[in-house]
């Protein structure tokens, strides 16, 4: 293995080593450590934990482990006014209240500093009015309510459903709709799994529990105060009013009992279908407003959190290459909690952890990678990826010049099913690769290697006999690595049968009954997944350290472009005769593509030939291979979001979890034939397949030979 | 119809033991929380704990740790409370009620 | 523990009144108190639940109101039936705890 090559290595020292040394009792300890007490960002608890984590990474023999604070903005709720919904009879009263908070879990009740349910950066206010259920809050949701069915939002409140997308897209969607003030509840269509128990029986979401969150639309700004630039001392910040991505309207989350009570007496319009439908015993009526009987009432939200420039902490750890010391692989992930963190961040964090401990042993007996390892403890990632993004600000030109790969490490699991991988496609191979190397921990698959469940549970739609790997999109630590920076990005973890179970991420995600004993007792009891996940993170980084020819592969990049190309074609295919009328060619894209397959064929070819004992031609070619992604980046970035720079991947602007290929061109033609001036809108088409077309052939030059 | 059936009151000497019962009908038995309360004669009401048939698990008021015992027989679907060392401070009425859930109020009741 | 104090602990009133009974919690509850009722040889009845839903074949002349630390049970147009010993209970923190009662009598 191309690993074992690595210098000062004995044969002792390979990955083997290195997988060996993780263990599944160790993940399990620090799980408990870090779930005790809540990790808010921002707060002094957290700092302490950071403070922690800098000693432990020390201990684990790290040759360096630095706190990088900075002053962002954060939101919280006012700790002697709560934030709550009532309805109110004509007279004004309040004859029904929401929840102040959940209810606490067995074993939790004297804990202090859990922060209520909050939608995090809602302003202010205490609108009334009547209420208008709008499904998903999705753009297609609102289409319907608008076109179709002839439902007005403006001046109303609207009540969505969490799921099927990023909640700050709801928001966004809410307050194009007029909106003023959005309830956001969880519905047990999407968080109770039939057949399974609520906290503290099984993994279901309680009546009583809500999702906490961030409602902000950054799109990759990091501190809304300060985009582009750290937020450091010297800072220069902007003014409230002209932050980046914050909501005009008052935003907060419910449980499934309070929902109840608001929906339970909607009247106006019915559902327009059954997808509009949950699982609660109410009629789904659309509205606006109550009901005959109660249609004198309305809802009144009462929100008063506050905004607050805060000190965040990332804990920065570094174990120096041997060779390459100036080339950085980089493990990451979040350390804030919206409480506990049991899950997110916790389970990943405590992954990390591991990994550290295990390349500190194999450091204090003589070993070093090729390259740089960089380790990261992420702070203020709920509250809109603020840690990772202001470091990398801080770093960036370090990072565009000297950034190979950066591996993401938020939650190790969101089920127990399968392996689940989002990347870029260079890492395809990497990851095929080191699964078939690693043991299945799945029941039925004693024996098989974890490449074989995968497949078996997870089959890639295209290729038969291969795993699903998925486009990175956003709503993680990665986002401003990959999208602004162009640095090859891979994430990994467990998940559920997304089949099967067709309820948003998991049920307890962001409430306070995401606790260690959620893991412990439901989740992983052998910590057997976490484990896995802890070989899926730790080998990618260490054979991209490690190897002497990075493994990228760039004729995977090749086959996607192609599959992309032909997808965009197809969307604007729907439109023959406005092509037809605007001139629009996709030709000058297809072309590329062609163009970087033959040329990515040529540079992996020699690849093979190359001589690796000569070390500047050996970094030519790595270097070739680590400015792939780079070359991806358009410094002009995408219309109307600059800090979303790639060309082939970006966060949908539908859905920010989602990614979108080819977003330049896939945002120009959606919608299209609803623009009010058609000429201008399929301009806009030409001009962005201008730009994908010149990217990819550019990118296509950089893999040729040199001279 | 859902129906709490209590065992009937008992004369016992100080120091020995007693096990009360509630056999419960109309539900699935596992799939509901049994709580036991103390009421002193005339007086406010007193929650002892929890059995949660569908996992054994039980929880008790730190007031009756050691005083009473929970316990289930899933295939009567009745749930029982031990209370030893008997003292007159124990003299009291005891009721069985239901709960959904953890977090649920009890909505059924023996008698 | 969470203490709950329920007052008034006596109250006498006359069919089609409308009554209220308090109770207070010695830190926040939320919304998660419930109020019961209590008839000499019958089993106890749930009337209320998270401070304000009414539990399902109870008359809804039974409302309850209140978050926080402060709760109310309104009787709207007493019925003959209601007059009984009523108690509220906090059902959002272990060990689960009662107030002292109220006993309603005809006046």
């Known amino acids: 293995k191309s690993s074992n090559e690595a210098t000062n290595i004995t044969p002792k020292h390979n990955m083997k080593a290195f997988l060996d040394e993780l263990k599944a009792e160790n993940i399990k300890k620090f799980l408990y450590n870090f779930t005790q007490i809540p990790h808010l960002a921002g707060t002094e608890q957290n700092f302490q934990l950071a403070k922690q984590i800098q000693s432990q990474w020390k201990e684990f023999g790290l040759d360096s482990v630095e706190l990088a604070h900075y002053d962002v903005l954060l939101s919280y709720p006012n700790k002697t006014h709560p934030n709550y919904i009532s309805i109110i009879n004509e007279d004004g009263n309040e004859i029904f209240n929401t929840s102040l908070f959940e209810p606490p879990p067995p074993g939790y009740e004297n804990v202090s500093d859990i922060v209520p349910p909050f939608s995090a950066f809602s302003p202010q206010g205490m609108p009334e009015g009547d209420l208008v259920y709008v499904n998903y809050a999705r753009t297609e949701d609102f289409f319907k309510l608008e076109r179709d069915m002839k439902i007005n939002c403006s001046g109303k409140i609207v009540i969505a459903r969490y799921g099927k997308v990023f909640r700050g897209n709801k928001v966004k969607n809410a307050q194009l709709a007029g909106a003023k003030g959005v309830i956001l509840y969880s519905d047990p269509a999407d968080y109770f799994a039939p057949g399974v128990k609520s906290y503290p029986d099984g993994w279901n979401l309680p009546g009583g529990g809500v999702q906490r969150g961030n409602i902000l639309n950054l799109n990759g700004a990091g501190d809304p105060l300060t985009p582009g630039y750290p937020a450091n001392e010297y800072a220069y910040r902007r003014g409230i009013a002209e932050a980046v991505g914050l909501p005009s309207i008052p935003v907060h989350p419910i449980g499934y009992y309070d929902a109840q009570k608001l929906l339970e007496k909607m009247g106006g319009s019915a559902p327009p279908d059954s997808s509009w439908r949950g699982s609660l015993k109410v009629p789904y009526n659309v509205g606006p407003g109550f009901t005959g009987n109660f249609s004198t009432q309305k809802v009144k939200m009462h929100i008063h959190s506050t905004n607050e420039v805060t000190r965040i902490y990332n804990v920065i750890g570094t174990l120096r290459g041997a060779v390459e010391p100036d080339r950085y692989v980089i493990l990451g992930g979040h350390r804030d909690s919206w409480v506990f963190g049991g899950i997110d961040p916790q389970s990943g964090a405590a992954v990390v952890h591991e990994i550290v401990r295990s390349f500190g042993t194999l450091k204090k007996e003589g070993w070093r990678p090729r390259r740089t390892i960089l380790f990261a403890s992420w702070d203020a990632e709920e509250f809109g990826l603020l840690g990772s993004t202001e470091w990398a600000e801080e770093n960036s030109r370090l990072l565009q010049e000297r950034g190979v790969a950066y591996i993401n490490a938020d939650s190790s699991i969101e089920g127990n099913y399968t392996l689940r991988v989002d990347c870029t496609p260079l890492m395809y191979s990497l990851v095929h690769n080191l699964t078939k190397e690693l043991k299945s921990p799945d029941e039925g698959f004693e024996g098989k290697s974890l490449y074989e469940s995968w497949t078996k549970k997870s089959p890639s739609p295209e290729f038969s006999g291969m795993p699903r790997i998925s486009k990175l999109g956003s709503g993680n630590d990665f986002e401003v690595f990959f999208q602004r920076l162009g640095i090859a990005s891979g994430r990994a973890r467990y998940t559920k049968n997304w089949e099967t179970n067709k309820f948003s991420g998991y049920p307890l995600y962001h409430s306070v009954y995401e606790t260690y004993e959620l893991v412990e007792k439901f989740y992983d009891p052998m910590f057997k997944y976490h484990l896995t996940v802890a070989q899926v993170r730790g080998g990618m980084v260490f054979e991209l350290a490690n190897s002497i020819v990075l493994p990228f592969d760039c004729r995977d990049y090749a086959v996607v472009l192609r599959k992309y190309a032909d997808k965009i074609y197809s969307i604007s295919m729907k439109h023959p005769q406005e092509m037809k009328t605007y001139s629009v060619s996709f030709d000058s894209l297809f072309s590329a593509v062609k163009n970087f397959t033959e040329i990515a064929s040529k540079f992996s070819e020699r690849l093979q030939d190359f001589d690796k004992s000569n070390p500047i031609v050996l970094r030519m070619m790595n270097d070739q291979l680590m400015f792939l992604e780079r070359a991806f980046i358009d410094p002009l970035g995408l219309p109307d979001r600059p800090f979303y720079r790639h060309v082939i991947y970006a966060p949908s602007s539908h859905n920010k979890y989602a990614g979108e290929s080819f977003p330049g061109i896939y945002d120009a033609l959606f919608d299209i034939e609803s623009k009010v001036d058609p000429s201008k809108a399929w301009g806009e088409v030409k001009r962005q397949i201008y730009v994908a077309a010149f990217t990819v052939q550019a990118a296509a030059e950089t893999l040729s030979e040199v001279a | 119809e859902i129906q709490l059936q209590q065992s009937g009151p008992e004369l016992v000497k100080p120091g020995a033991s007693v096990k009360m019962s509630c056999k419960a009908s109309?539900?699935?038995?596992?799939?509901?929380?049994m709580h036991w309360v103390k009421q002193n004669n005339g007086e406010s009401l007193e929650w002892i704990g929890y059995f949660n048939p569908y996992n054994d698990y039980t929880r008790y008021n730190q007031n009756f740790n050691g005083k009473a015992t929970l316990t289930v027989d899933k295939s009567s679907s009745t749930a029982y409370m031990q209370l030893n060392s008997l003292t007159s401070e124990d003299s009291a009425f005891y009721y069985c009620a239901r709960s959904d859930g953890y977090y649920d109020a009890m909505d059924y009741w023996g008698q | 523990d969470v203490q709950i104090t329920q007052s008034p602990s006596y109250l006498a009133a006359s069919p089609g009144e409308t009554i209220t009974i308090n109770c207070r919690a010695s830190k926040s509850i939320s919304k998660y108190l419930a109020w019961y009722q209590e008839k000499p040889g019958k089993a106890n009845k749930l009337l209320i639940h998270?401070?304000?839903t009414l539990q399902s074949g109870i008359p809804s002349r039974f409302s309850g109101s209140g978050s926080g630390t402060d709760f109310t049970l309104t009787i709207s147009s007493l019925e003959p039936e209601d007059f009984a010993m009523y108690y509220c209970?906090?059902?959002?923190?272990?060990?689960?705890?009662f107030g002292g009662g109220t006993k309603l009598e005809i006046k």
């Open positions: 209970q906090q059902h959002i923190e272990y060990p689960w705890t």
């Open positions: 109309g539900y699935t038995f596992t799939d509901y929380y």
């Open positions: 998270s401070g304000s």
